[in-house]
Protein backbone atom coordinates (compact mmCIF):
# COMPACT_ATOMS: atom_id res chain seq x y z
CA UNK A 1 0.00 0.00 0.00
CA UNK A 2 2.34 2.73 -1.17
CA UNK A 3 2.18 5.73 -3.46
CA UNK A 4 5.15 7.91 -4.47
CA UNK A 5 7.26 5.86 -2.06
CA UNK A 6 4.90 6.56 0.86
CA UNK A 7 3.00 3.81 2.66
CA UNK A 8 -0.70 4.59 2.75
CA UNK A 9 -1.68 1.63 4.94
CA UNK A 10 -0.30 -1.50 6.59
CA UNK A 11 -0.09 -5.15 5.64
CA UNK A 12 -2.50 -7.48 7.46
CA UNK A 13 0.00 -10.33 7.16
CA UNK A 14 2.77 -11.36 9.54
CA UNK A 15 6.18 -11.87 7.92
CA UNK A 16 8.97 -14.12 9.15
CA UNK A 17 12.42 -12.56 9.76
CA UNK A 18 13.93 -15.09 7.33
CA UNK A 19 11.94 -13.39 4.55
CA UNK A 20 13.33 -9.93 5.25
CA UNK A 21 16.65 -8.43 4.19
CA UNK A 22 16.25 -4.93 5.57
CA UNK A 23 13.89 -2.11 6.40
CA UNK A 24 13.33 1.61 5.99
CA UNK A 25 11.55 3.88 8.45
CA UNK A 26 8.83 6.15 7.09
CA UNK A 27 8.05 9.14 9.29
CA UNK A 28 4.76 11.01 9.12
CA UNK A 29 6.49 14.36 9.64
CA UNK A 30 8.74 13.87 6.61
CA UNK A 31 6.26 14.16 3.76
CA UNK A 32 4.18 11.00 4.28
CA UNK A 33 0.82 10.63 6.00
CA UNK A 34 1.64 7.80 8.41
CA UNK A 35 4.55 6.32 10.33
CA UNK A 36 5.54 2.96 8.87
CA UNK A 37 8.26 0.37 8.66
CA UNK A 38 8.92 -0.64 5.07
CA UNK A 39 10.30 -4.19 5.04
CA UNK A 40 12.38 -5.23 2.04
CA UNK A 41 11.91 -8.92 1.31
CA UNK A 42 14.03 -11.55 -0.41
CA UNK A 43 11.51 -11.49 -3.26
CA UNK A 44 12.30 -7.80 -3.80
CA UNK A 45 8.92 -6.69 -2.48
CA UNK A 46 8.42 -3.72 -0.20
CA UNK A 47 5.88 -4.35 2.56
CA UNK A 48 4.39 -1.57 4.67
CA UNK A 49 4.05 -2.56 8.33
CA UNK A 50 2.69 -0.91 11.46
CA UNK A 51 5.62 0.14 13.71
CA UNK A 52 3.42 -0.28 16.80
CA UNK A 53 2.82 -3.99 16.26
CA UNK A 54 4.86 -6.44 18.31
CA UNK A 55 5.96 -8.61 15.39
CA UNK A 56 7.20 -5.52 13.52
CA UNK A 57 9.15 -4.27 16.55
CA UNK A 58 10.63 -7.76 16.96
CA UNK A 59 11.95 -7.91 13.40
CA UNK A 60 13.27 -4.33 13.54
CA UNK A 61 15.11 -5.24 16.75
CA UNK A 62 16.55 -8.41 15.16
CA UNK A 63 17.72 -6.59 12.05
CA UNK A 64 19.15 -3.70 14.07
CA UNK A 65 21.09 -6.19 16.20
CA UNK A 66 22.48 -7.83 13.05
CA UNK A 67 23.71 -4.47 11.74
CA UNK A 68 25.34 -3.65 15.12
CA UNK A 69 27.18 -6.98 15.12
CA UNK A 70 28.61 -6.51 11.62
Amino acid sequence: ASNFDCCLGYTDRILHPKFIVGFTRQLANEGCDINAIIFHTKKKLSVCANPKQTWVKYIVRLLSKKVKNM
Partner: antibody
Framework: QVQLVQSGAEVKKPGASVKVSCKAS????????MHWVKQAPGQGLEWIGV????????TYNQKFKGKATMTRDTSTSTVYMELSSLRSEDTAVYYC?????????????WGQGTSVTVSS | DIQMTQSPSSLSASVGDRVTITCGAS??????LNWYQRKPGKAPKLLIY???NLADGVPSRFSGSGSGRDYTLTISSLQPEDFATYYC?????????FGQGTKLEIK
Protein backbone atom coordinates in the same frame (compact mmCIF):
# COMPACT_ATOMS: atom_id res chain seq x y z
CA GLN B 1 4.99 -25.11 33.62
CA VAL B 2 3.22 -23.75 30.56
CA GLN B 3 -0.42 -24.82 30.33
CA LEU B 4 -3.23 -23.95 27.95
CA VAL B 5 -6.60 -25.13 29.25
CA GLN B 6 -9.56 -24.94 26.88
CA SER B 7 -13.27 -24.93 27.59
CA GLY B 8 -15.35 -28.10 27.25
CA ALA B 9 -17.07 -29.72 24.28
CA GLU B 10 -20.03 -27.93 22.70
CA VAL B 11 -23.01 -29.12 20.67
CA LYS B 12 -24.76 -26.38 18.73
CA LYS B 13 -27.57 -26.02 16.23
CA PRO B 14 -26.91 -24.66 12.72
CA GLY B 15 -26.98 -20.85 12.69
CA ALA B 16 -25.95 -20.54 16.34
CA SER B 17 -22.67 -19.16 17.69
CA VAL B 18 -20.13 -20.65 20.07
CA LYS B 19 -17.37 -19.05 22.13
CA VAL B 20 -14.38 -21.22 23.01
CA SER B 21 -11.94 -20.14 25.71
CA CYS B 22 -8.27 -20.86 26.30
CA LYS B 23 -6.73 -20.02 29.68
CA ALA B 24 -2.95 -19.65 29.75
CA SER B 25 -0.69 -20.14 32.76
CA UNK B 26 2.98 -20.68 33.51
CA UNK B 27 4.33 -17.83 31.39
CA UNK B 28 3.87 -14.11 30.72
CA UNK B 29 0.62 -14.05 28.76
CA UNK B 30 1.34 -10.85 26.81
CA UNK B 31 4.76 -12.00 25.56
CA UNK B 32 3.49 -14.67 23.16
CA UNK B 33 0.94 -14.86 20.38
CA MET B 34 -2.01 -17.21 20.54
CA HIS B 35 -3.07 -19.07 17.42
CA TRP B 36 -6.21 -21.09 16.74
CA VAL B 37 -6.08 -24.23 14.62
CA LYS B 38 -8.96 -26.34 13.30
CA GLN B 39 -9.01 -30.09 12.80
CA ALA B 40 -12.19 -31.35 11.15
CA PRO B 41 -12.99 -35.10 11.35
CA GLY B 42 -10.64 -37.06 9.10
CA GLN B 43 -8.97 -33.86 7.90
CA GLY B 44 -5.61 -32.18 8.46
CA LEU B 45 -4.72 -29.07 10.44
CA GLU B 46 -5.94 -25.66 9.32
CA TRP B 47 -4.69 -22.32 10.66
CA ILE B 48 -7.55 -19.98 11.59
CA GLY B 49 -5.72 -16.91 12.83
CA VAL B 50 -3.65 -15.35 15.58
CA UNK B 51 -4.05 -12.76 18.31
CA UNK B 52 -1.29 -10.77 20.00
CA UNK B 53 -2.45 -10.54 23.64
CA UNK B 54 -0.27 -7.48 24.27
CA UNK B 55 -2.35 -5.21 22.02
CA UNK B 56 -5.24 -7.38 20.71
CA UNK B 57 -3.86 -7.25 17.16
CA UNK B 58 -5.43 -10.05 15.12
CA THR B 59 -4.93 -11.45 11.67
CA TYR B 60 -7.06 -14.19 10.11
CA ASN B 61 -6.88 -16.76 7.40
CA GLN B 62 -9.11 -15.26 4.68
CA LYS B 63 -11.21 -18.42 4.79
CA PHE B 64 -12.23 -17.69 8.40
CA LYS B 65 -12.82 -13.94 8.13
CA GLY B 66 -16.40 -13.31 9.21
CA LYS B 67 -16.56 -16.79 10.77
CA ALA B 68 -14.05 -16.49 13.63
CA THR B 69 -13.45 -13.60 16.01
CA MET B 70 -10.57 -13.71 18.48
CA THR B 71 -10.44 -11.65 21.66
CA ARG B 72 -8.44 -11.68 24.88
CA ASP B 73 -8.76 -10.78 28.55
CA THR B 74 -5.38 -9.95 30.06
CA SER B 75 -6.79 -9.88 33.61
CA THR B 76 -7.48 -13.64 33.41
CA SER B 77 -4.82 -14.56 30.81
CA THR B 78 -7.56 -15.96 28.61
CA VAL B 79 -8.04 -15.90 24.85
CA TYR B 80 -11.44 -16.47 23.24
CA MET B 81 -12.55 -17.49 19.79
CA GLU B 82 -16.15 -17.01 18.75
CA LEU B 83 -17.49 -18.89 15.74
CA SER B 84 -20.67 -17.46 14.24
CA SER B 85 -23.40 -18.72 11.88
CA LEU B 86 -22.43 -22.31 12.56
CA ARG B 87 -22.78 -24.90 9.80
CA SER B 88 -22.10 -28.63 9.68
CA GLU B 89 -18.64 -27.98 8.17
CA ASP B 90 -17.66 -26.13 11.36
CA THR B 91 -17.82 -29.44 13.23
CA ALA B 92 -14.23 -29.94 14.37
CA VAL B 93 -11.76 -29.91 17.21
CA TYR B 94 -10.37 -26.42 17.77
CA TYR B 95 -6.97 -25.91 19.37
CA CYS B 96 -5.40 -22.83 20.87
CA UNK B 97 -1.65 -22.88 20.61
CA UNK B 98 1.10 -20.54 21.76
CA UNK B 99 3.14 -18.82 19.07
CA UNK B 100 6.75 -18.28 19.99
CA UNK B 101 9.02 -15.89 18.06
CA UNK B 102 11.99 -17.41 19.86
CA UNK B 103 11.51 -20.82 18.29
CA UNK B 104 11.12 -19.71 14.69
CA UNK B 105 7.48 -18.64 15.00
CA UNK B 106 6.57 -22.21 15.95
CA UNK B 107 3.53 -23.27 17.96
CA UNK B 108 5.31 -24.69 20.98
CA UNK B 109 2.46 -25.44 23.44
CA TRP B 110 -1.06 -26.58 22.63
CA GLY B 111 -4.35 -26.71 24.48
CA GLN B 112 -6.15 -30.05 24.80
CA GLY B 113 -8.65 -29.08 22.09
CA THR B 114 -12.34 -28.21 22.20
CA SER B 115 -14.77 -30.32 20.22
CA VAL B 116 -17.54 -28.34 18.53
CA THR B 117 -20.36 -30.36 16.97
CA VAL B 118 -22.94 -28.64 14.77
CA SER B 119 -26.05 -30.73 14.42
CA SER B 120 -29.76 -30.12 14.02
CA ASP C 1 -1.22 -18.57 -0.21
CA ILE C 2 1.72 -20.95 0.04
CA GLN C 3 0.73 -24.60 -0.55
CA MET C 4 2.47 -27.39 1.35
CA THR C 5 2.54 -30.92 -0.07
CA GLN C 6 3.65 -33.89 1.99
CA SER C 7 4.62 -37.32 0.79
CA PRO C 8 3.83 -40.05 1.29
CA SER C 9 0.33 -39.53 2.71
CA SER C 10 0.69 -42.81 4.60
CA LEU C 11 3.56 -45.11 5.38
CA SER C 12 3.91 -48.55 6.97
CA ALA C 13 7.14 -49.26 8.81
CA SER C 14 8.58 -51.44 11.57
CA VAL C 15 10.20 -50.62 14.89
CA GLY C 16 13.89 -49.86 14.23
CA ASP C 17 13.33 -48.66 10.66
CA ARG C 18 14.69 -45.39 9.33
CA VAL C 19 11.84 -43.28 7.98
CA THR C 20 11.83 -40.15 5.84
CA ILE C 21 8.87 -37.84 5.23
CA THR C 22 9.12 -35.04 2.68
CA CYS C 23 7.39 -31.71 2.46
CA GLY C 24 7.37 -29.43 -0.56
CA ALA C 25 6.34 -25.78 -0.61
CA SER C 26 4.80 -24.07 -3.63
CA UNK C 27 7.54 -21.43 -3.38
CA UNK C 28 10.77 -20.78 -1.50
CA UNK C 29 10.03 -20.51 2.24
CA UNK C 30 13.65 -19.88 3.29
CA UNK C 31 13.66 -22.48 6.08
CA UNK C 32 10.58 -21.05 7.82
CA LEU C 33 9.21 -24.54 8.36
CA ASN C 34 8.11 -26.50 11.41
CA TRP C 35 7.18 -30.16 11.96
CA TYR C 36 4.50 -31.47 14.36
CA GLN C 37 3.47 -34.92 15.57
CA ARG C 38 -0.16 -35.73 16.32
CA LYS C 39 -1.48 -38.85 18.01
CA PRO C 40 -5.20 -39.77 18.00
CA GLY C 41 -7.16 -37.87 20.64
CA LYS C 42 -4.14 -35.75 21.59
CA ALA C 43 -3.01 -32.24 20.76
CA PRO C 44 -0.21 -31.84 18.20
CA LYS C 45 3.33 -31.60 19.53
CA LEU C 46 6.16 -29.48 18.13
CA LEU C 47 9.09 -31.60 16.92
CA ILE C 48 11.28 -29.42 14.71
CA TYR C 49 11.37 -25.66 14.23
CA UNK C 50 13.23 -23.57 11.68
CA UNK C 51 13.55 -26.67 9.43
CA UNK C 52 16.46 -28.17 11.41
CA ASN C 53 16.16 -27.37 15.13
CA LEU C 54 14.98 -29.98 17.61
CA ALA C 55 12.30 -28.74 20.00
CA ASP C 56 12.80 -29.14 23.75
CA GLY C 57 12.31 -32.68 25.01
CA VAL C 58 12.19 -34.25 21.54
CA PRO C 59 14.40 -37.37 21.15
CA SER C 60 17.50 -37.01 18.99
CA ARG C 61 16.30 -39.77 16.61
CA PHE C 62 14.18 -37.02 15.01
CA SER C 63 15.93 -34.65 12.63
CA GLY C 64 14.95 -32.10 10.03
CA SER C 65 16.72 -30.89 6.93
CA GLY C 66 16.09 -28.94 3.77
CA SER C 67 16.00 -25.46 2.32
CA GLY C 68 14.23 -23.49 -0.38
CA ARG C 69 11.10 -25.42 -1.33
CA ASP C 70 12.05 -28.93 -0.16
CA TYR C 71 12.20 -30.25 3.40
CA THR C 72 12.58 -33.60 5.11
CA LEU C 73 11.75 -35.09 8.51
CA THR C 74 13.80 -38.19 9.37
CA ILE C 75 13.31 -40.67 12.20
CA SER C 76 16.56 -42.62 12.45
CA SER C 77 15.22 -45.64 14.34
CA LEU C 78 11.46 -45.91 14.79
CA GLN C 79 10.16 -46.50 18.31
CA PRO C 80 6.65 -47.80 19.16
CA GLU C 81 5.61 -44.33 20.38
CA ASP C 82 6.47 -42.74 17.02
CA PHE C 83 3.47 -44.20 15.19
CA ALA C 84 1.42 -41.06 14.64
CA THR C 85 0.54 -38.47 11.99
CA TYR C 86 3.18 -35.88 11.06
CA TYR C 87 2.55 -32.41 9.66
CA CYS C 88 4.83 -29.79 8.18
CA UNK C 89 3.91 -26.12 8.48
CA UNK C 90 4.94 -23.00 6.61
CA UNK C 91 5.44 -19.90 8.79
CA UNK C 92 7.04 -17.58 6.23
CA UNK C 93 3.96 -15.43 5.90
CA UNK C 94 0.38 -15.64 7.06
CA UNK C 95 -1.83 -17.49 6.41
CA UNK C 96 0.32 -20.23 7.88
CA UNK C 97 -0.34 -23.46 6.01
CA PHE C 98 0.08 -27.11 6.94
CA GLY C 99 0.83 -30.10 4.79
CA GLN C 100 -1.99 -32.64 4.54
CA GLY C 101 -0.22 -34.99 6.95
CA THR C 102 1.66 -38.29 6.77
CA LYS C 103 0.18 -41.16 8.75
CA LEU C 104 2.90 -43.50 10.00
CA GLU C 105 1.51 -46.98 10.74
CA ILE C 106 2.97 -50.19 12.11
CA LYS C 107 3.81 -52.76 9.43
Amino acid sequence: QVQLVQSGAEVKKPGASVKVSCKASGYTFTNYWMHWVKQAPGQGLEWIGVIDPSDSYTTYNQKFKGKATMTRDTSTSTVYMELSSLRSEDTAVYYCTRGNYGVDYAMDYWGQGTSVTVSS
Amino acid sequence: DIQMTQSPSSLSASVGDRVTITCGASENIYGALNWYQRKPGKAPKLLIYGATNLADGVPSRFSGSGSGRDYTLTISSLQPEDFATYYCQNVLITPYTFGQGTKLEIK
